[in-house]
């Protein structure tokens, strides 16, 4: 049921990376507008993106209040210029989103290698601890703050002269690896949350190689 010429939203999809979370849907509106509501399973509905002609709504501010909660959103359709109009059942047409649990489902953003330092045959590689939009005590938390030891990084490293990639793992943001003296190495890191069943891995960081700016070499 619904108002004449008003169609319900469909393909409601959560797009979320490092907790920046946007709900997207179809169709592009023709003579209609949308309002989004979001709620936890036990909470009240909160309205966002009032009477918008967009087909997306940024819900980050709501989900970061508790990233371990499970959220549900719904998209209401209204005739343009007559938003008070309702469907035959006495309320606007709407469609529910899939459930979304940010802690378990937000995509891991591409990490960045902050620096690397060689001391003899050891190299220390540091991964940037990316800031999220999750807040605690008025401070933005880093990815490590949010995930703790649930978040690990896999380092792929290889001699510049070869292609085979060795791996190392850390549950901090630092790696200490052994390298061959006199060889240049390249590095790339991947964020992983092993306890997840979906969205477990990030895309790889940009590659950084020894002999470039980010590194420091000290002969001991």
């Amino acid at each position: 049921s619904g108002t004449t010429n008003t169609v319900a939203a469909y393909n409601l999809t959560w797009k979320s990376t490092n907790f920046k979370t946007i709900l997207e849907w179809e169709p592009k509106p023709v003579n209609q507008v949308y309002t989004v509501q979001i709620s936890t399973k036990s909470g009240d509905w909160k309205s966002k993106c009032f009477y918008t002609t967009d087909t997306e709504c940024d819900l980050t501010d709501e989900i970061v209040k508790d990233v371990k909660q499970t959220y549900l959103a719904r998209v209401f359709s209204y005739p343009a210029g007559n938003v008070e109009s309702t469907g035959s059942a006495g309320e606007p047409l709407y469609e529910n989103s899939p459930e979304f649990t940010p802690y378990l489902e937000t995509n891991l953003g591409q990490p960045t290698i902050q620096s690397f330092e060689q001391v003899g045959t050891k190299v220390n590689v540091t991964v940037e601890d990316e800031r999220t939009l999750v807040r605690r005590n008025n401070t933005f938390l880093s990815l490590r703050d949010v995930f703790g030891k649930d978040l690990i990084y896999t380092l792929y490293y290889w001699k510049s002269s070869s292609s085979g990639k060795k791996t190392a793992k850390t549950n901090t943001n630092e790696f200490l690896i052994d390298v061959d003296k006199g060889e240049n190495y390249c590095f790339s890191v991947q964020a992983v949350i092993p306890s997840r069943t979906v969205n477990r891995k990030s895309t790889d960081s940009p590659v950084e190689c020894m002999g470039q700016e980010k590194g420091e070499f000290r002969e001991i």
Epitope: I152, K166, A168, V192, T197, T203
Partner: antibody, heavy 121, light 107 residues
Framework: EVQLVESGGGLVQPGGSLRLSCAAS????????IHWVRQAPGKGLEWVGY????????YYADSVKGRFTISADTSKNTAYLQMNSLRAEDTAVYYC??????????????WGQGTLVTVSS | DIQMTQSPSSLSASVGDRVTITCRAS??????VAWYQQKPGKAPKLLIY???FLYSGVPSRFSGSRSGTDFTLTISSLQPEDFATYYC?????????FGQGTKVEIK
């Protein structure tokens, strides 16, 4: 149910080639890491190489480097071991195994049934 | 590469015996050691990971421990189905390496 099924083994002459497949079901391979391990008759386990199907990263044991290539087709949820320039000492049962992490420690929780490769003239 | 030296290479024991197999890593591998059981003609099966964690579905008579670079697999009371070959493995660095195996036979 998680399962790995190898295929493609057989008898091949020295210098020949063979491609082994490792078909996964019950999970998607890009979320994990796939290793190949072999076991010569009456011998212990020897690691051959790995692939991260998510990004294509690979590494090989020195004994097979330059001759063997591991790849993955995520649309088929299958990993492959391409073996070229085969030698008698490559004769073994070849296993693929799924690797996962517990914290930073890796473990191989599911293995295929193995496929026998015999290199002989 | 890290060497995993496993001992003994074989042992004979009776049902009900306590069996201990050890592996020594040639350098620090932290807790990145797993133990596998293999029966003839079958693929290896994971028993222990992270040195001391019992894998799901594995009987509690199996346990693992670590002391520095020494790792131990213990079977508290050997059962008929435990006669098999056991391998330790380190995953701390690439390449991962296995011990030579310990064959547990019936006395």
């Amino acid at each position: 149910e998680v399962q790995l099924v190898e295929s493609g083994g057989g008898l091949v002459q020295p210098g020949g080639s063979l491609r082994l497949s490792c078909a996964a079901s019950g999970f998607t391979i890009p979320s994990y890491w796939i290793h190949w391990v072999r076991q010569a008759p009456g011998k212990g386990l020897e690691w051959v190489g790995y692939i991260d199907p998510y990004n294509g990263a690979t590494y090989y044991a020195d004994s097979v480097k330059g001759r063997f290539t591991i790849s993955a087709d995520t649309s088929k949820n299958t990993a492959y071991l391409q073996m070229n320039s085969l030698r008698a000492e490559d004769t073994a049962v070849y296993y693929c195994a799924r690797a996962d992490y517990h914290g930073v420690d890796e473990y191989w929780d599911y293995w295929g049934q193995g496929t026998l490769v015999t290199v002989s003239s | 590469d890290i060497q995993m030296t496993q001992s003994p290479s074989s042992l004979s024991a009776s049902v009900g015996d306590r069996v201990t197999i050890t592996c020594r890593a040639s350098q620090d591998v932290n807790t990145a050691v797993a133990w596998y059981q293999q029966k003839p003609g079958k693929a290896p099966k994971l028993l222990i990971y992270s040195a001391s964690f019992l894998y799901s579905g594995v009987p509690s008579r199996f346990s693992g421990s670590r002391s520095g670079t020494d790792f131990t697999l213990t079977i508290s009371s050997l059962q008929p189905e435990d006669f098999a070959t056991y391998y330790c493995q380190q995953h701390y660095t690439t390449p991962p390496t296995f011990g030579q195996g310990t064959k547990v036979e019936i006395k």
